[in-house]
Interface confidence: low
Amino acid sequence: IPVIEPSVPELVVKPGATVTLRCVGNGSVEWDGPPSPHWTLYSDGSSSILSTNNATFQNTGTYRCTEPGDPLGGSAAIHLYVKDPARPWNVLAQEVVVFEDQDALLPCLLTDPVLEAGVSLVRVRGRPLMRHTNYSFSPWHGFTIHRAKFIQSQDYQCSALMGGRKVMSISIRLKVQKVIPGPPALTLVPAELVRIRGEAAQIVCSASSVDVNFDVFLQHNNTKLAIPQQSDFHNNRYQKVLTLNLDQVDFQHAGNYSCVASNVQGKHSTSMFFRVVESAYLNLSSEQNLIQEVTVGEGLNLKVMVEAYPGLQGFNWTYLGPFSDHQPEPKLANATTKDTYRHTFTLSLPRLKPSEAGRYSFLARNPGGWRALTFELTLRYPPEVSVIWTFINGSGTLLCAASGYPQPNVTWLQCSGHTDRCDEAQVLQVWDDPYPEVLSQEPFHKVTVQSLLTVETLEHNQTYECRAHNSVGSGSWAFIPISAGAHTHPPDEFLFTP
């Protein structure tokens, strides 16, 4: 670390005095201090001498000696006071620029340390400081305004009490600049716009920033629009608003509108699309197939997308039958809005009952008229089976009726012994009936089929089983001939109760 002679932290001299400051280091050394007249510099290898034969108040300041070659970057300093009875202040700069919330140093250096007790900071023309101005003083450096605010951008003077009167420094102008975090904030309203030809429309582009220096403009497609600008200041932000009012829109007004704002930090832009249409429109669509199949007991959401302008005047879900006159509960329907002109309507059908199969229609109305979208909902059922013994054309016949949806397939099994259900080990014969007779097949209802098995002689120690299956499940009915007549037995686990 370099060494300064004289080896004191502070030196007080009178104007006109000779001052010699010598710095010695291991290598070459350099002096740094306030810009002031009359200094002479002599360098001699590892020492450097700063001297003046005529010290003035302007030589007041801190002189620092550094050794550029020192890796630790050490330095030594001495503060010189040139105590001038007529000049208590040496002002190093008359303009100080800081950003908000930074500390602002007003560099008025006291030329006589004994005056420290009577110093103060004032605004020019003797005006007091603004309320909440938090400041401190250092005789070596001057006044520091802590966490400076934009509103504290003023002209200041440093005041010292000399012989009972206040002596002012020359003025120092403080400029506190707003911290501009980025380009101005933007809003463009609405985000999307549709109008019928001849209607009125309004598009509002507004930008705001903490600093007044920014530009904003609205452009249509790629043409900048000449619109008068309204300016305002509130919530500590400057606002500039451009409002485009169109009394009667036409097709040439349609297109892309961009709101663009820029400042020193850069540019922001946001866009919206304006559609002009010939007349009101109302379009209904669905992502789903309009023909739905669901297993009984399960749930389903029916969803309709609506695009409309002007807005909907009414909408509802309606059940069109055929089973009952019930209507969908409002609490099962909900609506969500993607934006002003597009909506989604959902009807939730939880745990569907047999009577809820049928047609569901969503109806919507706006000035463009009514539109409807109808879903057809068919319920799937596992088969229910029953078997009876009868005579047809004189022949003994087992008659199996199976009911379900989709249409069940039928298989007959003959097995040894009396059993509720034939297992593989017992099976003697299997007959598939690829084309059972369809007894009934109405929309939204179960399909009922009938299969006949002609049996010349019923074997009494055997079981005849009719099995039916479809994509939902299966059902069966076991027929056990007994000497006292035909006995039938449907196993419990294959009974189906919706």
């Epitope: 992502e287 997308m305 909900n334 969500t336 993607k338 989604t344 959902t346």
Partner: antibody, heavy 119, light 111 residues
Framework: QVQLQQSGPELVKPGASVKLSCKAS????????INWVKQRPGQGLEWIGW????????KYNEKFKGKATLTVDTSSRTVYMEFHSLTSEDSAVYFC????????????WGQGTLVTVSA | KIVLTQSPASLAVSLRQRATISCRAS??????????MHWFQQKSGQPPKLLIY???NLESGVPARFSGSGSRTDFTLTIDPVEADDAATYYC?????????FGSGTKLELK
């Protein structure tokens, strides 16, 4: 069936722009939003924005405003995403994905396009 | 912005055991009775695949061993039983508020 076919991999220099495409087939093109999603190598998924083909309207993630531009060509059923002022942070796989209206999930995805930004 | 926090970041599960992945939202969301939370599966080099939509609805063609539950801020994806083909990264995603956001992902490995 619904398909989203994306353009091939791109090697681009820092500061340049790149334009990716996503061609849709198998459904009514103008009815559904096309979203774009970014995935950096070994990282998670980030939504960039959507474009609505019927009128070309867009919605962007604020983070990608000014960085990405979404456009649509209904005649070729193609959606484009142009990425500007590329840096190494933009090296990623970019997916397009189809969604319906509000709240609809991204049920169909393109295979992804790898963009590598390198000097 | 809704932040979705997934846990755990990774988990190892034995075949035919149950795997549970949690997704917590930084704020509650529930629009018109709909919860727009979706779950995706992503395997290396492939795009994400939708598994569950609106918190609990199974996407067509997805095996019934995948299920989703939850509401407001806490959501869960359950795989029971886990099969070898389920090794992948799983993401939750919210479509309720812009910007749309994804969870950070959970990597599922098989022991």
């Amino acid at each position: 069936q619904v398909q989203l076919q994306q353009s091939g991999p791109e090697l681009v220099k820092p500061g340049a722009s790149v334009k990716l495409s996503c061609k849709a087939s198998g459904y009514t093109f103008t009815t559904y939003d096309i979203n774009w999603v970014k995935q950096r190598p070994g990282q998670g998924l980030e939504w960039i924005g959507w474009v609505y083909p019927r009128d070309g309207s867009t919605k962007y993630n604020e983070k990608f405003k000014g960085k990405a531009t979404l456009t649509v060509d209904t005649s070729s059923r193609t959606v484009y995403m142009e990425f500007h002022s590329l840096t190494s942070e933009d090296s990623a796989v970019y997916f397009c994905a189809r969604s319906g209206l509000t709240g609809s999930p991204f049920a169909y995805w393109g295979q992804g396009t790898l963009v590598t930004v390198s000097a | 912005k809704i932040v979705l926090t997934q846990s755990p970041a990774s988990l190892a599960v034995s075949l035919r055991q149950r795997a549970t992945i949690s997704c917590r939202a930084s704020e509650s969301f529930d629009s018109y009775g709909n919860t727009f939370m979706h779950w995706f599966q992503q395997k290396s080099g492939q795009p994400p695949k939708l598994l569950i939509y609106r918190a609990s609805n199974l996407e067509s063609g997805v095996p019934a061993r995948f299920s989703g539950s939850g509401s407001r801020t806490d959501f869960t994806l359950t795989i029971d039983p886990v099969e070898a083909d389920d090794a992948a990264t799983y993401y939750c995603q919210q479509n309720n508020e812009y910007p749309l956001t994804f969870g950070s992902g959970t990597k599922l490995e098989l022991k």
